[in-house]
């Protein structure tokens, strides 16, 4: 059997790894596979990076081709540019290196193209059809730091076996990315496991110093302790557990008191029983059983809505009578026509018009019945002042090759680590759009085309978008890399209407940003089923203060000081919430609990396929997420009002891929 095609392999430097996966995949499948592991298709932008790719690929057969992260849309030829109109899957065209097999030839570039690297010879770049399943693909993984490979010791039974965060197992690494595990087997029989962790003094290093295979006490195999081993004065060993865990009966292993806790929503370690239960915002503990949570009916609160109010389990929505429109504050109503806004129809058409057969695309869209269920690592919010619309996406990259952000990036505050905070939830106002981008976002489902943003024009200083970059959300808190949090202070809310906080499930892992409540995340990904109201469900509307039974499980609604995406129930023609393009209740906006001054809404279309991993995880792994009601009818189309004075400057990212009126699923943009 071909050694080249046997197993995936990787080459790592101090800040990034390239991995070769010899698996036959189309471009889209390869892109998804890299993303699922927390990386991206390889983007060798410098001669040095290309050299690392060359050494990894080696001398394969001439017939072998490997996808790299370059894609070009139809009619996007720019032959005079180094990348010829191709864009890295990270959304930009920055490069200091190319390796095209042929000189650029003039032509109309009628179709979408993707780039594959030859496994033989000079590893030249070839362009071709993105739907071909080539022989493999190259992924790239960026990280904060790396640990050097362990030196072999005299007492070792064999070389250390390393497991990377992207699940590659090998003995052949020079550097191990942050979060890697090293397993060392000693001749004496016992072994040692080490983790590449963040060091208190800065940087990263192995969780234990050598020698690993000598002596007694805690040295071999951590003294048999699952977490911490303590060598007592008298020489014997005792085990301790990290915060939030308790020592099991065997005195060695550690158990999570929340693992078996009967909390309906959230569990926090500690308290007399070893755990305490909490409810999400908008819920309160049941009087007869503090483990259960019951809905709070905000519609009973005087003045919560000016006219009509509908209470959902976990949320509420204000409505206006016929002839009135919901104002931007989400509470007040004004006569219809008083707040006209730009519809998205023309913009959607423009974003999507690339000359392909519309009729066929309509059919493809009908076949794609699942609807949009997740947006990898992208959160949206409209600003109070409509800016030149831009979307930033921050992939993980080697530190020396950080891609250019399409706007100046703030340099403060300093990096923070995720703190353990008291368990509470709050929503704070924000007057600017916020983008949260996880370095390791979750893979989109098979039914969902992933979105790759294009490069966008720079924003003025007034409209800069804060970025929160997160790394390795699946690692235990003790081993989390530092998290960079940068933001601008909000504009003074002096003349802004009051904000109503609404209910929502906890949506983000705590380690993704210092803004969220504490979480300990186990080594597996958490699957969250995000709920939506079925489009055929007409919420019962009551006048202010009227009692309303729960209508749908955990409907997600946001009210902030920023201009809102409207929510219009499809079966309520007499009610209007705004003059902008409608969004069905199934496509609602949810917010994470925040302890920092920002409310982070996410556009969350409904209908996640079963077991689909969401990029948005619960705040605690023990949070129980509700199941999504299944929808049999076609997914409602969605229109997004983009607050841009110039539609041509709008981003292609979300508008093109899934939010404009005529968006169909195809593979033009991944």
């Amino acid at each position: 059997q071909d050694p080249w095609a046997a197993e995936p392999r990787a080459a790592c430097g101090p800040s990034s790894c390239y991995a070769l996966f010899p698996r036959r995949r189309t471009f889209l499948e390869a892109w998804r596979a890299c993303r699922e592991l927390g990386g991206d298709l390889a983007t060798p932008r410098t001669p040095e990076e290309a050299q690392r790719v060359d050494s990894l690929v080696g001398a394969g057969p001439a017939s072998r081709l490997l996808w790299i992260g370059l894609q070009r849309q139809a009619r996007q030829c720019q032959l005079q540019r180094p990348l010829r109109g191709f864009t890295w899957t990270t959304g930009d065209q920055d490069t200091a290196f190319t390796n095209w097999a042929q000189p650029a030839s003039g032509g109309p570039c009628p179709a979408q193209r993707c780039v594959a690297l030859e496994a033989s010879g000079e590893h030249r770049w070839l362009e071709g059809s993105c739907t071909l399943a080539v022989d493999g693909y190259l992924c790239q993984f960026g990280f904060e730091g790396a640990c050097p490979a362990l030196q072999d010791e005299a007492g070792q039974a064999g070389p250390a076996v390393y497991t990377t965060p992207f699940h590659l197992v090998s003995t052949e690494f020079e550097w191990l990315p942050f979060g890697s595990v090293a397993a060392v087997q000693c001749q004496a029989g016992r072994g040692a496991s080490l983790l590449c962790v963040k060091q208190p003094e800065g940087g990263v290093g192995w969780s234990r110093a050598g020698p690993l295979c000598l002596g007694t006490g805690c040295s071999p195999d951590n003294g048999g302790c699952e977490h911490e081993c303590v060598e007592e004065v008298d020489g014997h060993v005792s085990c301790r557990c990290t915060e939030g865990f308790r020592l099991a009966a065997d005195g060695r292993s550690c158990e999570d008191p929340c693992a078996q806790a009967p909390c309906e929503q959230q569990c926090e370690p500690g308290g007399p029983q070893g755990y305490s239960c909490h409810c999400r915002l908008g819920f309160r503990p049941a009087e007869d059983d503090p483990h259960r949570c019951v809905d709070t009916d905000e519609c009973q609160i005087a003045g919560v809505c000016q006219q009509m109010c509908v209470n959902y389990v976990g949320g509420f929505e204000c409505y206006c009578s016929e002839g009135h429109e919901l104002e931007a504050d989400g509470i007040s109503c004004s006569p219809a026509g008083a707040m006209g806004a730009q519809a998205s129809q023309d913009l959607g058409d423009e974003l999507l018009d690339d000359g392909e057969d519309e009729e066929d695309e309509d059919e493809a869209w009908k076949a794609f019945n699942g609807g949009w269920t997740e947006m990898p690592g992208i959160l949206w919010m409209e600003p109070t002042q409509p800016p030149d619309f831009a979307l930033a996406y921050r992939p993980s990259f080697p530190e020396d090759r950080e891609p250019q952000i399409p706007y100046p990036e703030p340099t403060w505050p300093p990096p923070l680590s995720a703190p353990r905070v008291p368990y509470h939830s709050s929503v704070l106002s924000v007057t600017r759009p916020v983008v949260v981008s996880a370095t390791h976002p979750t893979l989109p489902s098979a039914h969902q085309p992933p979105v790759i943003p294009a490069t966008h024009p720079a924003l003025s200083r007034d409209h800069q978008i804060p970025v929160i970059a997160a790394n390795y959300p699946d690692l235990p808190s003790a081993y989390q890399p530092g998290i960079l949090s940068v933001s601008h202070s909000a504009q003074p809310p002096a003349h802004q209407p009051p904000m109503i906080s609404t209910k929502y499930p906890e949506l983000f892992p705590a380690h993704q940003s210092p803004m969220f409540p504490d979480t300990r995340v186990a080594g597996t990904q958490t699957t969250t089923h995000l709920p939506g109201i079925p489009p055929n469900h007409a919420p019962l509307v009551t006048t202010l203060g009227a009692q309303l039974p729960p209508q749908a499980p955990d409907a997600l609604v946001l009210r902030t000081q920023a201009t809102q995406l409207p929510i219009i129930p499809t079966a309520q023609p007499s009610l209007t919430t705004t003059s902008r393009s409608p969004v069905s209740p199934a496509h609602q906006i949810s917010v994470p609990a925040a302890t920092q001054p920002a409310a982070l809404p996410t556009l969350l279309p409904s209908q996640s396929p079963t077991n689909q991993t969401s990029p948005i995880s619960p705040t605690h792994p023990h949070s129980k997420a509700p199941q999504i009601p299944r929808e049999d009818g076609p997914s409602p189309k969605l229109a997004l009002w983009l607050p841009s004075p110039a539609p041509t400057a709008a981003p292609t990212a979300l508008g093109e891929a899934g939010l404009a009126e005529h968006s169909q699923r195809d593979d033009r943009w991944l």
């Epitope: 071909d2 095609a5 057969p61 017939s63 179709a111 979408q112 739907t131 593979d667």
Partner: antibody, heavy 124, light 108 residues
Amino acid sequence: QVQLQESGPGLVRPSQTLSLTCTASGYTFTDYVIHWVRQPPGRGLEWIGYINPYDDDTTYNQKFKGRVTMLVDTSSNTAYLRLSSVTAEDTAVYYCARRGNSYDGYFDYSMDYWGQGSLVTVSS
Amino acid sequence: DIQMTQSPSSLSASVGDRVTITCRASQNVGTAVAWLQQTPGKAPKLLIYSASNRYTGVPSRFSGSGSGTDFTFTISSLQPEDIATYYCQQYTNYPMYTFGQGTKVQIK
């Protein structure tokens, strides 16, 4: 220049196994996938499957799964097709064809060279 | 399986005429489409690959276009030696390669 030459018995009895040979020359055999395609008399082309001589990787048309076997001998630059339990429906001209890899800076998997074909009649 | 529906099944045209053959894929195949020419009693020959690229040595009167599901093959000026059957073929690898039914081109 690149050449592909099919050979095999022109007549096979029903329920027997059809065996064909494709000899390649003029290029590095292990660098290109070999396809087998057939064409019943007066009808269109039907893909049977392919084999990659580099690593013996095969992909077959579901229609022939269980009946078809493809093999290669890299020392003699030869590909083999075996189709078992044949019936009169398997009467056809059988072609071997080479899958291209790249042309003028494009990668592509179309079949760039074909053999002249070998007529196999299944009859008792 | 991906079906390739080719039309017309046959056509007659005069020398110098423009001839167009269409092929529709049952699902998106990107640009992984080839056009082959088969003259009577001979093996097929590759004319167009990747939907629109002319193969080496193929006269410029032959051209192809399209992507996704709809593809067109054109002979800009029919010549006597072009009398043949023309096939479209998709080769996305998933799950198999398939051919159109063929279009027989004759001269009036």
